[in-house]
């Protein structure tokens, strides 16, 4: 079992969606889980977020806000074997440029 490299960082505007993928070469039904290391808090173990979905073990975070910032790590495990872990992707949340208050839609804070 081996894992493809993941991006070192991901920048997402406030209120948008973040997609993290965990590509791996497992042909079996590997178990993908996602974990987060919080800003300035590198204690172990990290916070468990939930399972990945689809063949790439995708983690979707809708409606991103500042509190979502941190390092996102996926783990892939086949059966009872020891898991492989990604190096982690750092999520940076940026404030989008101001827009008219009434212009709210799929890609905005109320999404």
């Amino acid at each position: 079992l081996w894992m493809h490299k993941v991006p070192a960082s991901l920048m997402v505007s406030l209120g948008e969606d973040a997609h993290f993928q965990c590509p791996h070469n497992s042909s079996n039904n590997a178990n993908v889980t996602w974990w987060r290391v919080l800003h300035g808090n590198y204690t172990w173990p990290p916070e468990f977020l939930g399972p990945g979905e689809d063949p790439n073990g995708t983690l979707i975070i809708q409606n991103v806000n500042k509190s979502h910032g941190g390092i996102y790590v996926c783990r892939v495990q086949e059966g009872n074997e020891s898991y492989q872990q990604s190096c982690g992707t750092y999520l940076r949340v940026r404030q989008p440029p101001p827009r008219p208050f009434l212009d709210m839609g799929e890609g905005t804070k109320n999404r």
Epitope: E16, D17, H19, W34, L49, G50, P51, G52, E53, L59, I60, I61, Q62, N63, N65, R99, D103, M104, G105, E106, G107, N110, R111
Partner: antibody
């Protein structure tokens, strides 16, 4: 795989309340909006509202404010909708649904099997 | 709120024929980010709705290529090139550009002639 499992059919009396559950698995529950949709006889589909389990934020269709209350329990990955002061017009099938339309060519769309609510004396 | 108007209400077809359903919105569905969040669903009797097309023309995973979506701004069309028995049901368009609330069209019932 992603699953949304709703509670069973309900037969309730006018004026009463009912609470429908939507138990989820297979994704990170806290980070996706959970939507609720009404499918009434001859009424088509109506969006009731949504909840973001991570922080409890809710948005409601104005038509259902005061009628529906959305909650979520992160510990059990379950979303709930309570309908109050029920009348015959509330008789319908109610769906929980998770959808994402983002990225250039990316979509996620999962619905519960539906919960039938019948209001009758 | 954005009002979605579908036509026709009922569409009788013969198997193998082409079917076309129209959806019109009360305001443009082009979002400021350039995307158009117009989607098509099929609901069969006793089932939950199933996503067919998202963002005007993108087929959802597992949807046969006989389904296609087109349109822009306020006018959109779903086409089924060769209708099969499993395609029968009620088709809904939906918008998620101006939300909340998400809004749906009134539905078009595809039935055998």
């Amino acid at each position: 795989q992603v699953q949304l499992q709703q509670s069973g059919p309900e037969l309730v009396k006018p004026g009463a309340s009912v609470k429908i559950s939507c138990k989820t698995s297979g994704y990170a529950f806290s980070f996706s909006w959970m939507n609720w949709v009404k499918w009434g006889p001859g009424q088509g589909l109506e969006w009731i509202g949504r909840i973001y389990p991570g922080n409890g934020d809710t948005n409601y269709n104005g038509k259902f404010k005061g009628k529906a209350t959305l909650t979520a329990d992160k510990s059990s990955n379950t979303a709930y909708m309570q309908l109050s002061s029920l009348t015959s017009v509330d008789s319908a099938v109610y769906f929980c649904a998770r959808w994402v339309y983002s990225g250039n060519n990316y979509a996620v769309d999962y619905w519960g099997q539906g919960t039938s609510v019948t209001v009758s004396s | 709120d954005v009002v979605m108007t579908q036509t026709p209400l009922s569409l009788p077809v013969s198997l193998g024929d082409q079917a076309s359903i129209s959806c019109r919105s009360s305001q443009s569905l082009v979002h400021s980010n350039g995307n158009t969040y117009l989607h098509w669903y099929l609901q069969k009797p006793g089932q939950s709705p199933k996503l067919l097309i998202y963002k005007v023309s993108n087929r959802f995973s597992g949807v046969p290529d006989r389904f296609s979506g087109s349109g822009s701004g306020t006018d959109f069309t779903l086409k089924i090139s060769r209708v099969e028995a499993e395609d029968l049901g009620v088709y809904f368009c939906s918008q998620s550009t101006h939300v909340p609330p998400y809004t749906f069209g009134g539905g078009t019932k595809l039935e055998i002639k």
